[in-house]
């Protein structure tokens, strides 16, 4: 008995297509070895005619393929434009060799079948319209023209010219001519079914010298097209059902017994699985439309079918497409966490996978937005300015060629909970969702910024210090310059890792910025923060405001009268002299894009290179003012 | 909603046939799949064959046991499937019920895959 099993026996007629699946048992050695589909000759040799390898012979060529669904445990051969040729045994199978595990399949193909001479085909899709054209002689121009279908024993009347019209073909039903031909009628059927194929004959006038004239119809299923997609990715469901419903609402919808769900509709509804990873996008006014799915799961497989009516529903005789989705959980894309956690004033850092293949990708966050059709408008990209509303809040740092990128996100509101995608624009199937979730802050923040009042004076020295707690002690600290195109890393220094102890006083935690002397671009947003590595994690945010001097009163820095803050400012101050032109834009920056700025704070440089520079949203490394400087030792 | 009724079922001699009737009523579309699971007894249900059927193309599944004894046939007009059964054993004894899903995905041999099913009609063969 093979462990193999499929089709014994697969009928079909000339000119059609074949879909067969092969089941092979549940193991690692299957899943992954070659698969073949080979003809059984005469001599009990068995000739290959595709193979999962890649191999496809000659007369399988343009119109056959093989697929493997390795978390099914089945491969799939698919044939079309069958011709009589085809008719034969076969084996689907595995193994290196066609002598491996197989099952015998048996395929016959038929001529299509015979049907009286003066039969005219008509195939359609099912929701479509057909036209059937009836000739007849002039004679018979004034007698009454008929369309009936052909049951077992008699013909049933569908339409005539007296306008006499069958109960199920009401509303689809028309009977016309066109213009001055009086040679012949047309019959116009609308909204097909299933149960509309058959026999049909028109005729215009009686007895024996009517005009007769026989038609098959055909009202064929679509075939669905086979989707494979990866856990986690996302599908795009492109469906085209033409100008004649270009006005009518659209859905997708899955099968579920004998009814098709909606999952999502140009009305407004959406199935709640999907809330957060699902867009409807109209491509264009002749019926044309897309469905995105972001964030697949295992439990998405199955058969989808899109199409139009006025309810937004699925509606008998309507046109569709329908999809066979497959999801594989043995997936490229990384499993990260779908639910990221913050709390109110707080910050999160949302690590976004991309194809490591494109690290040149632009990359992007969006916020799905669940009103209408739903959409998500972009909030960030390494060639997109942040959003006016998210200003001094909102940074992507690019690590070029690690397959990620991070999204940071501070100064939390409970109105940021949420779904975001991160998306780039190249390899669609990387697009993920993430779910924020805000909550009340119950405590402090972990990192504190002083002095919070922050208004430097033009000319003069100014310095912030950030405080984190003990449990950051191990983790790289820094500042940073916010523009709306990222955040670019500045030099600063570490208070609490300088420190030869052993234990860590809460209260002396600390890494401080000064600028010296502040001129009027050092106004704006900077970021405190701490990384390990190219994990960025909490970061806190404080706006810098820079006021002109007031005249005759010498100025000391609001620095809180706060001793921690103090620490920081009784350090020797040395000029790092950096020139204007050096702190240019560097396109696409490397993680060390500011490293030349590094390098000249002297003694400092080599414990700062860690941190580096997380690159701004499009490589551009606008530094505050280029008088940054460091405290030194 | 599809309802399924069996009939054909009855005592025989071992190599005698019998003929199984699935009348569906309701609709069946240009796509489906119809199957024949059989219980004996103190024994699980099992897979004995089945039909899927899309647009023109038809696709027959069988269990080892039956091949080329057991043959699946439908008619499309009277919505009604068949399974002739030759070369009848005693082994073959079994309460035989008819499976219909409007799908023609999922392996036929899993029941799961079927969402209408019949009351069940009885085969005995004696020896």
């Known amino acids: 008995k093979s462990p193999i099993f499929g089709p014994q026996e697969v009928s079909s007629i000339e000119g059609d297509s074949v879909s067969i699946t092969c089941y092979y048992p549940d193991t690692s050695v299957n899943r992954h070895t070659r698969k073949y589909w080979c003809r059984q000759g005469a001599s009990g040799m068995c000739t290959t005619l595709i193979s999962s390898n890649g191999y496809l012979s000659k007369e399988y060529s343009g119109r056959a393929n093989l697929i493997n669904f390795p978390e099914n445990n089945t491969f799939v051969i698919n044939i079309e434009q069958l011709t009589q040729d085809d008719t034969g045994s076969y084996k689907c199978g595995l193994g290196t060799s066609n002598r491996g595990l197989s099952f015998d399949v048996s395929l016959e193909v038929s001529q299509v079948p015979e049907l009286p001479s003066d039969t005219h085909v008509y195939t359609k899709d099912i929701g479509r319209n057909v036209t059937i054209e009836c000739p007849f002689k002039r004679e018979n121009a004034p007698s009454k023209k008929s369309l009936c279908k052909k049951t077992n024993q008699s013909c049933e009347l569908v339409i005539d010219s007296t306008e006499k019209v069958n109960p199920s073909y009401i509303g689809r039903a028309k009977l016309f001519m066109k213009g001055t031909d009086l040679t012949v009628f047309y019959v116009n059927i609308s909204h097909l079914t299933h149960n509309d194929a058959g026999l049909y004959i028109c005729q215009a006038g009686e007895g024996p010298s009517a005009d007769k004239k026989n038609v098959d119809l055909q009202v064929l299923a679509p075939e669905p097209e086979l989707l494979y997609k990866d856990l986690r990715s996302s599908v795009t469901f492109e469906c085209d059902l033409g100008r004649e419903v270009a006005n009518e609402a659209k859905y997708l919808c899955r099968m579920n017994k004998e009814t098709c769900d909606v999952i999502i509709n140009t009305l407004g509804k959406r199935d709640p699985d999907f809330e957060g990873r699902i867009l409807i996008t109209p491509k264009d006014d002749n019926g044309r439309f897309s469905v995105l799915i972001t964030g697949l799961r295992k439990e998405d497989a199955g058969h989808y079918q899109c199409g139009a009516h006025s309810s937004g529903l699925p509606q008998e005789g309507w046109p569709i497409q329908t999809w066979q989705l497959f999801v594989n959980e043995e997936s490229t894309i990384p499993n990260r966490r779908s639910v990221v956690k913050g709390v109110t004033g707080g910050s999160v850092a949302i690590a976004c996978p991309y194809n490591p293949k494109e690290s040149s990708s632009l990359k992007y966050w969006c916020r799905w937005e669940g009103d209408g059709n739903g959409h998500c408008p972009v909030l960030v990209g390494t060639q997109a300015q942040v959003q006016e509303e998210y200003e001094g809040r909102l940074a992507l740092f690019d690590q070029p060629g690690n397959g990620t990128y991070t999204v940071i996100l501070n100064q939390l509101t409970t109105e940021d909970a949420g779904f975001y995608w991160c998306l780039t624009n190249g390899d669609s199937r990387w697009r993920t969702t993430i779910e924020l979730q805000v909550a009340e802050a119950t405590r402090e923040p972990n990192l504190e910024v002083t002095p919070q009042n922050a208004t430097a004076v033009l000319g003069e020295t100014f310095t912030v210090s950030c405080h984190y707690p003990c449990k950051f002690y191990s983790q790289e600290k820094y500042w940073c310059k916010w523009s709306n195109k990222g955040c670019h890393i500045l030099p600063s220094h570490d208070e609490g890792a300088r420190q030869s102890s052993v234990s860590c006083d809460q209260s002396s935690q600390l890494v401080s910025m000064t600028l010296n002397p502040v001129s009027k671009e050092d106004e704006g947003w900077y970021w405190c923060g701490v990384k390990q590595g190219q994990t960025y994690g909490e970061t806190t945010a404080i706006y810098i405001a820079v006021e002109e001097r007031t005249r005759g009163s010498s100025h000391v820095n609001p620095t809180d009268a706060n001793a921690r803050a103090k620490v920081a400012l009784e350090e020797e101050v040395v000029d790092s002299s950096i020139s204007e032109k050096e702190n240019k834009a560097i396109p696409n920056p490397g993680p060390f894009a500011n490293e030349r700025e590094i390098q000249n704070v002297g003694d400092q440089a080599q414990e700062n290179r860690a941190s580096g520079d997380a690159g701004s949203a499009d490589g551009q490394s606008r530094s505050s003012s280029s008088k940054h400087h460091h405290h030194h030792h | 909603e599809v309802q399924l009724v069996e009939s054909g079922g009855g005592l025989v001699q071992a190599g005698d046939s019998l003929r199984l009737s699935c009348a569906a009523s309701?609709?069946?579309?240009?796509?489906?799949?119809m199957g024949w699971f059989r219980q004996g007894p103190g024994k699980e249900r099992e897979f004995v064959a089945a039909?899927?059927?899309?647009?023109?193309?038809?696709?027959?599944y069988y269990e080892d046991s039956v091949k080329g004894r057991f043959t699946i046939s439908r008619d499309n007009a009277k919505n009604t499937a068949y399974l002739q059964m030759n070369s009848l054993k005693p082994e073959d004894t079994a309460v035989y019920y008819c499976?219909?899903?409007?799908?023609?995905?999922?392996?036929?041999?899993?029941?799961?895959?079927?969402?209408?099913w019949g009351q069940g009609t009885l085969v005995t063969v004696s020896s």
């Open positions: 309701g609709r069946t579309g240009s796509s489906g799949a």
């Open positions: 499976a219909a899903d409007p799908d023609t995905y999922g392996d036929p041999r899993n029941s799961g895959a079927y969402d209408y």
């Open positions: 039909l899927m059927w899309r647009n023109t193309v038809t696709y027959k």
